[in-house]
């Protein structure tokens, strides 16, 4: 997260850290005991699932594997659209204050809303600065027509913008498949952005869920 | 120090099949991307394809596509290019190269290894 | 997919000259578009990225401007260090990564 500062202790329980051993991979959010859902893009072959802790690393977080995930059937490696995957918990997460279930969207949310995106990603970019605890910043919901003046055709039609303008304000390496969070539904999973991170008036660009919670829960009921 | 090595120099008949690899170090290898660009004596240089060294995920140049097959071991960080059903016109220079950018996009190559030489000849 | 023409293709300099180089792509690729230094025997280097942004450790005296179509790489004041060839690339419409021929900056 570039710009942005220590998410409120427990103001995130819901947030996930998928790693590689025990280094970070990727961002993501428990939707129930069972599901983490995250950005396509993330895709391993197996997982390790941080939660229920702020800090990484820390001995009192959960940490449990995961072996299964299902990407978005539509998702392309060369246009990055519908970026979003669910990965199955090998066992189920133990819900408390610490670990709580997201909530998914039952509408979008629209530009101009305040939404905070979070992670454990770097804090510098193109040099690297990995925070041990979470990470947040506020960003706007900025509208597609205001996006595609900068990203152009990149910009596909589930894909939602975020940003502050002329400030660095965004998401960054590791945060990939984190939530962007906005009237405490989740409207975002971070999916990319220009590099070096945090360039000024170069929007975040986020999958936007509230068009996918049929898939999502589909999907799901299908795995079960 | 964050490098990319490649392997050595190979002489190849046409018809075989030849296989490059890089090795990364000094970075996290399963964070980037790695693709694959050659360059014919005296030529420019040619894009052959990329894979997510995390996903396995690759994308092929349409001209290559059925001949090349790109692969990553993470346990060693090295990326692999194989590039079969050797011709003439194969014989180049190949590089291995890491794109930049954060999450599903990147957008330019900072660093490249230090290249191998593949010829082909009866 | 997307062409990149460079020109010239080549070009003959003397030490302390401002050199210009040339990017055209085929349609508009907004200011995604990299310039790279290639000296013989040796690997491309990344010199600007995003048309105008220099790369850390990268003199100064390059830089680049342009967006849509249109790209320039100048050299303010050519180093003897300079003479190399020098390649764009663009990443907008990927896959595939496509190169421009390169230009080839030799001694006057």
């Known amino acids: 997260i570039i710009d942005g500062a220590p998410c409120a202790r427990g103001s995130h329980p819901w947030q996930v850290a998928l790693l590689s051993g025990n280094q970070l991979h990727c961002g993501g959010v428990l939707v129930n005991e069972r599901w983490v859902l995250t950005a396509a893009h993330c895709k391993m072959n197996e997982y390790t699932v941080h939660l229920g802790s702020d800090t990484l690393g820390d001995r009192r977080a959960q940490r449990i594997k995961a072996s299964k995930s299902f990407r978005h059937p539509g998702y392309s490696t060369q246009t990055h659209v519908n970026d979003l995957m669910l990965v199955k918990l090998n066992s189920q997460a133990r819900l408390s204050s610490m670990v709580k279930k997201v909530r998914l969207p039952s509408r979008c949310e629209p530009p101009g809303t305040t939404c905070t995106v979070s992670g454990w990603g770097t804090t510098t970019s193109p040099d690297v600065t990995f925070p041990s605890d979470l990470m947040c910043v506020d960003v706007k919901l900025i509208s597609p027509q205001d996006c595609t003046k900068v990203y152009k055709d990149l910009l596909e039609n589930s894909m939602l913008c975020a940003g502050i303008p002329d400030s660095k304000k965004n998401a960054c390496n590791g945060d990939s498949g984190g939530p962007l969070v906005c009237r405490g539904t989740l409207q975002g999973l971070v999916s990319w952005g220009t590099f070096p991170c945090g360039q000024p008036n170069d929007p975040g660009v986020y999958t936007q869920v509230c068009k996918f919670t049929k898939w999502i829960n589909d999907t799901m009921k299908k795995h079960r | 120090q964050v490098q990319l090595v490649q392997s050595g120099a190979e002489v190849k008949k046409p018809g075989a099949s030849v296989k490059v690899s890089c090795k990364a170090s000094g970075y996290t290898f399963t964070s980037e991307g790695i693709h694959w660009v050659r360059q014919a004596p005296g030529q420019g240089l040619e894009w052959m394809g990329s894979i997510s060294a995390s996903s396995g995920d690759t994308n092929y140049a349409q001209k290559l596509q059925g001949r090349v097959t790109m692969t990553t071991d993470t346990s060693t960080s090295t990326a692999y290019m194989e590039l079969r059903s050797l011709r003439s016109d194969d014989t180049a220079v190949y590089y291995c190269?890491?794109?930049?950018?954060?999450?599903?996009?990147?957008?330019?190559?900072?660093?490249w290894g230090q290249g191998t030489m593949v010829t082909v000849s009866s | 997919d997307i062409q990149m023409t460079q020109s010239p293709s080549s070009l003959s300099a003397s030490v302390g000259d401002r050199v210009t180089i040339t990017c055209r792509a085929s349609q508009s690729i907004s200011s995604y578009l990299n310039w790279y230094q290639q000296k013989p025997g040796k690997a491309p280097k990344l010199l600007i990225y995003g048309a105008s942004s220099l790369q850390s450790g990268v003199p100064s005296r390059f830089s680049g401007s342009g967006s849509g179509t249109d790209f320039t790489l100048t050299i303010s004041s050519l180093q003897p260090e300079d003479f190399a060839t020098y390649y764009c690339d663009q990443w907008y419409s990927t896959p595939p990564i496509t190169f421009g021929g390169g230009t080839k900056v030799e001694i006057k």
């Open positions: 190269a890491r794109s930049a950018g954060y999450g599903a996009r990147h957008w330019y190559f900072d660093l």
